[in-house]
């Protein structure tokens, strides 16, 4: 058993049929010594008396809010949550496996630049009695500070018969050094509590590996005289790190016909313009990637050829 | 650098960008194969990192690029030695057309632009990284290449910025 926060405790249980459970001793936070009784949740049934209460925690029915009283007055509370371990593996019932970029990916994180700011998100099908708490640091043995906000519900989607909820959180490294080569990864820890079930999820990454620039901005076409060619130009996204002579991007320009089956023409360039042939009903798209490190491409910015 | 000494920024930029390409072709991103899960603290913590105080940021380069270039030079020698060591030359053998050979040569090429011509660096340190089993060697290769990708990315940014803003 360990303390998650004040008066909230997590009991770690090996979860299998007829498991013996864990013996837990609760102590009433009071100077009183006599006339103390204990109850669980809203029940008025007295579970025991005295300053301490010893219970055997085996299942969710044994978890909940234990309260000690004296003469009708509440003295203190202890909330017990369960953390299940099945076959040596902690349960992951609350969050959905996003399976990207690999199986058992529950947290996904992205950064728009090298400033030390990043966003993580996760999915669940649970809609109520759900709380999340997020902590982060750079490195684990001698951790350096990363400040995370509160997790918020950021999207709701219907997937077949059930609803899926996306939560996200923004974090910022306290003393970010955008130009340095990271040697210690960022660690993100999410505590999830659904009713009386506790689970924790972690992710470890370098900012450089989760970079995904915003799409190029101000995408424009300029027809070239007496030619089917056009000059496409664009700019670095506002959110990208500066100066651009240091934090450089590379770009992919694509000409795509109306039909998905049509052959795509692609050009790669480090410049912020390119000359391409504009076909009727086609569209021109441009995306960006860090020039020197192969992290994710941005989403496409597109304009129609017409 | 004081005394009017600056590297051939454009040459260095071209070579370092080539190094980035080669480092990724030598070890493409295999579904974000997370090598940190393999407990590599002791193996790749020993490689040089371009750290915050090394002056490799745009302001540091403007003030005095010497310490940054020194750090890059040391890193290039270190990785060149690693790629020439039995970690890469031992079993399992690299494919004949492996980009590691080109990568090794390019590391040497870039380091030569930053040092007197004809240095043959020797070291006692690299063997301490050498694994005994072929599978360990394979894993270590991946880890070294992943570290190298991060290192040369910073070096390439430095030289690109230098070529754009510090060239005479």
């Amino acid at each position: 058993i360990w303390e998650l926060k004040k008066d909230v405790y997590v009991v770690e249980l090996d979860w299998y049929p007829d498991a013996p459970g864990e013996m837990v001793v609760l102590t009433c936070d009071t100077p009183e010594e006599d006339g103390i009784t204990w109850t669980l949740d809203q029940s008025s049934e007295v579970l025991g008396s005295g300053k301490t209460l010893t219970i055997q925690v085996k299942e969710f029915g044994d978890a909940g809010q234990y309260t000690c009283h004296k003469g009708g007055e509440v003295l203190s509370h202890s909330l017990l949550l369960l953390h299940k371990k099945e076959d040596g593996i902690w349960s992951t019932d609350i969050l959905k496996d996003q399976k990207e970029p690999k199986n058992k990916t529950f947290l996904r994180c992205e950064a728009k630049n090298y400033s030390g700011r990043f966003t993580c998100w996760w999915l669940t099908t649970i809609s109520t009695d759900l709380t999340f708490s997020v902590k982060s640091s750079r490195g684990s043995s001698d951790p350096q500070g990363v400040t995370c906000g509160a997790a918020t519900l950021s999207a709701e989607r219907v997937r077949g018969d059930n609803k899926e909820y996306e939560y996200s959180v923004e974090c910022q490294e306290d003393s970010a050094c955008p130009a340095a080569e990271e040697s210690l990864p960022i660690e993100v820890m999410v505590d999830a509590v659904h009713k009386l079930k506790y689970e924790n999820y972690t992710s470890s990454f370098f900012i450089r590996d989760i970079i995904k620039p915003d799409p190029p901005k101000n995408l424009q076409l300029k027809p070239l005289k007496n030619s089917r060619q056009v000059e496409v130009s664009w700019e670095y996204p506002d959110t990208w790190s500066t100066p651009h002579s240091y934090f450089s991007l590379t770009f992919c320009v694509q000409v795509q016909g109306k039909s998905k089956r049509e052959k795509k023409d692609r050009v790669f360039t480090d410049k912020t313009s390119a000359t391409v042939i504009c076909r009727k009903n086609a569209s021109i798209s441009v995306r960006a990637q860090d020039r020197y490190y192969s992290s994710s491409w941005s989403e496409w910015a597109s304009v129609p050829c017409s | 650098v004081p005394g009017g000494s600056s590297p051939a920024w454009t040459q260095c930029q071209q070579l370092s960008q080539k190094l980035c390409t080669l480092a990724w072709s030598a070890h493409p991103l295999v579904g974000h194969m997370d090598l940190r899960e393999e407990g590599d603290e002791e193996t790749t913590n020993d490689v040089p990192h371009i750290q915050c105080g090394d002056g490799c940021d745009p302001q540091g380069l403007r003030d005095n690029s010497q310490f940054c270039l020194q750090r890059i030079h040391q890193g290039l020698i270190f990785y060149e030695k690693l790629l020439g060591s039995d970690i890469f030359t031992g079993e399992p053998s690299l494919l004949p057309d492996s980009p590691v050979g080109q990568l090794h040569a390019s590391l040497l090429g870039l380091s030569q632009l930053l040092q007197p011509e004809g240095h043959h660096w020797e070291t006692q340190q690299i063997p301490s990284l050498s694994p005994s089993q072929p599978w360990q060697r394979l894993l270590l290769r991946f880890k070294i290449l992943r570290s190298l990708q991060a290192f040369v990315a910073v070096a390439a940014r430095v030289f690109a910025h230098g070529a754009a803003t510090l060239s005479p």
């Epitope: - | 051939a8 010497q66 040391q74 040092q115 240095h119 660096w121 020797e122 070291t123």
Partner: antibody, heavy 120, light 112 residues
Framework: EFQLQQSGPELVKPGASVKISCKAS????????MNWVKQSKGKSLEWIGV????????SYNQNFKGKATLTVDQSSSTAHMQLNSVTSEDSAVYYC?????????????WGTGTTVTVSS | DVVMTQTPLSLPVSLGDQASISCRSS???????????LHWYLQKPGQSPKLLIY???NRFSGVPDRFSGSGSGTDFTLKISRVEAEDLGVYFC?????????FGGGTKLEIN
């Protein structure tokens, strides 16, 4: 002020080895490479080799390969040079010299010099 | 190895005179990075050498402006515009473009 304080004079028997030291002060030891230079009596200077202190990388003049071994002790900011199997040809003053840094490669801070005399 | 040839071997001068020392290398000292690594050192009697001029023409800190260096490729010159008593000693040219670094044989500047 930058200083390189070298160990005192050495009288060595032919065939023996001798290790001389050079303690750096006034600057960050690992930021600059350390060179060693030989000056025989009434003669010019010969570059022996160089060591990069934070990784122990060494590069030698081929004429001194096997003769000289360069090492550093980062914790005490001290560079060492060992001369092996000495002969009368090795009698000389040996200097440790800091180089000016990357892309400068001049020898800007010279040690006090250590006189090695080989005699039976 | 690059051979550095210094002339003259000995240079007698009167105080206040101009002195000129020549240094020639057996191959070009222009590095592939475009810089030329030719330096001049002065060794006074009983002392360690000291750096005077680096990279052909740059005076090292604290070196008086009566010292100047010039040259390119394989031919280099050190000039002292007005010799003072404290300038006496042996002058060495040296190259660090190629490994091993090499030094000239030295030129002894002495009073006439």
């Amino acid at each position: 002020e930058f200083q390189l304080q070298q160990s005192g004079p050495e009288l060595v028997k032919p065939g023996a080895s001798v290790k001389i030291s050079c303690k750096a002060s006034g600057y960050s030891f690992t930021d600059y490479n350390m060179n060693w230079v030989k000056q025989s009596k009434g003669k010019s200077l010969e570059w022996i080799g160089v060591i990069i202190p934070n990784y122990g990388f060494t590069s030698y003049n081929q004429n001194f390969k096997g003769k000289a071994t360069l090492t550093v002790d980062q914790s005490s900011s001290t560079a060492h040079m060992q001369l092996n199997s000495v002969t009368s040809e090795d009698s000389a003053v040996y200097y440790c010299v800091r180089d000016g840094g990357i892309l400068l490669w001049y020898l800007d801070v010279w040690g006090t010099g250590t006189t090695v005399t080989v005699s039976s | 190895d690059v051979v550095m040839t210094q002339t003259p071997l000995s240079l007698p001068v009167s105080l206040g005179d101009q002195a000129s020392i020549s240094c020639r290398s057996s191959q070009s000292l222009v590095h592939s990075n475009g810089n030329t690594y030719l330096h001049w050192y002065l060794q006074k009697p009983g002392q360690s050498p000291k750096l005077l001029i680096y990279k052909v023409s740059n005076r090292f800190s604290g070196v008086p402006d009566r010292f100047s260096g010039s040259g390119s490729g394989t031919d280099f010159t050190l000039k002292i515009s007005r010799v003072e008593a404290e300038d006496l000693g042996v002058y060495f040219c040296s190259q660090s473009t190629h490994v091993p670094y090499t030094f000239g044989g030295g030129t002894k500047l002495e009073i006439n």
